[in-house]
Amino acid sequence: VSITKCNSDMNGYCLHGQCIYLVDMSQNYCRCEVGYTGVRCEHFYL
């Protein structure tokens, strides 16, 4: 799978994680930090 960094406009899209662009799927994706979940890594779980 080809990935690259998200466009500048997506800075801040992922609240607790890193935004990556999945080129083959034409999708932005939030890779969440440990302890966070949700489309935008907005939910904390224990």
């Epitope: 466009n7 406009d9 801040g12 609240l15 080129v23 932005n28 489309v39 935008r40």
Partner: antibody
């Protein structure tokens, strides 16, 4: 399936304000950004601004700063674009556009006519 | 704001011709450019995103290329149904549309 349903056509007098709504279904607007784009009759496409409904952060094109207000009500999954001090040049079709995980998905457009 | 200079503003070509439209950005947009087709009375239709990624259902005669500040949109063999106005859109840093190119049949 995912939808963005915009409010109906409006006719306004110069100097008045207009508020266009954009109701999302099939997805949560908190997962997206909502952009607003307009197109005057016979003219090109013009980006106006956008809101991040989760953070409640807005960004506007400089030429609209101070005259446009974009808001979102996450409880009703609806975004709004209000344009004030209307003039005849604001006569246009106004589109809301979803962006975020997937690329842009457009509403059907709302015609706003400014006429005395 | 990033500026997008699209050219030409209009063109006339024959059915079967190769048609090329260019967009130049005022700064590097890292391949984050999309191309839209718009027919009179209709909302814009997304053809290509991320420079060259064709949307599902879009004919393969449409293609895109470029990097940095210079991007190209090509129709390899113009068809009567391709008569429309085409717009580029940079979405690297906020959004800016090009001025549009009206494509007509000779």
């Amino acid at each position: 399936q995912d939808q963005l349903v915009q409010s109906g056509a409006e006719v306004k007098k110069p100097g008045a304000s207009v508020k266009v709504s954009c109701k999302a279904s099939g997805f949560n607007i908190k997962d997206t950004y909502i952009q607003w784009v307009r197109q005057a009759p016979g003219q090109g496409l013009e980006w106006m601004g956008r809101i991040d409904p989760l953070r409640r952060q807005t960004k506007y094109r400089e030429k609209f700063e101070g005259r446009v207000t974009i808001t979102a009500d996450t409880s009703t999954n609806t975004a709004y674009m209000e344009l004030s001090s209307l003039r005849s040049e604001d006569t246009a079709v106004y589109y809301c556009v979803r962006s975020g995980r997937e690329f842009d998905f457009w509403g059907q457009g709302t015609l706003v006519t400014v006429s005395s | 704001d990033i500026q997008m200079t699209q050219s030409p503003s209009s063109l006339s070509a024959s059915v079967g011709d190769r048609v090329t439209i260019t967009c130049k950005a005022s700064q590097d947009i890292h391949k984050y450019i999309a191309w839209y087709q718009q027919k009179p009375g209709q909302a814009p239709r997304l053809l290509i995103q991320y420079t060259s990624t064709l949307q599902p259902g879009v004919p393969s005669r449409f293609s895109g290329s470029g990097s940095g500040t210079d991007y190209t949109f090509t129709i390899s063999s113009l068809q009567p149904e391709d008569i429309a106005t085409y717009y580029c859109l940079q979405y690297d840093n906020l959004r800016t549309f090009g001025g549009g190119t009206k494509v007509e049949i000779k």
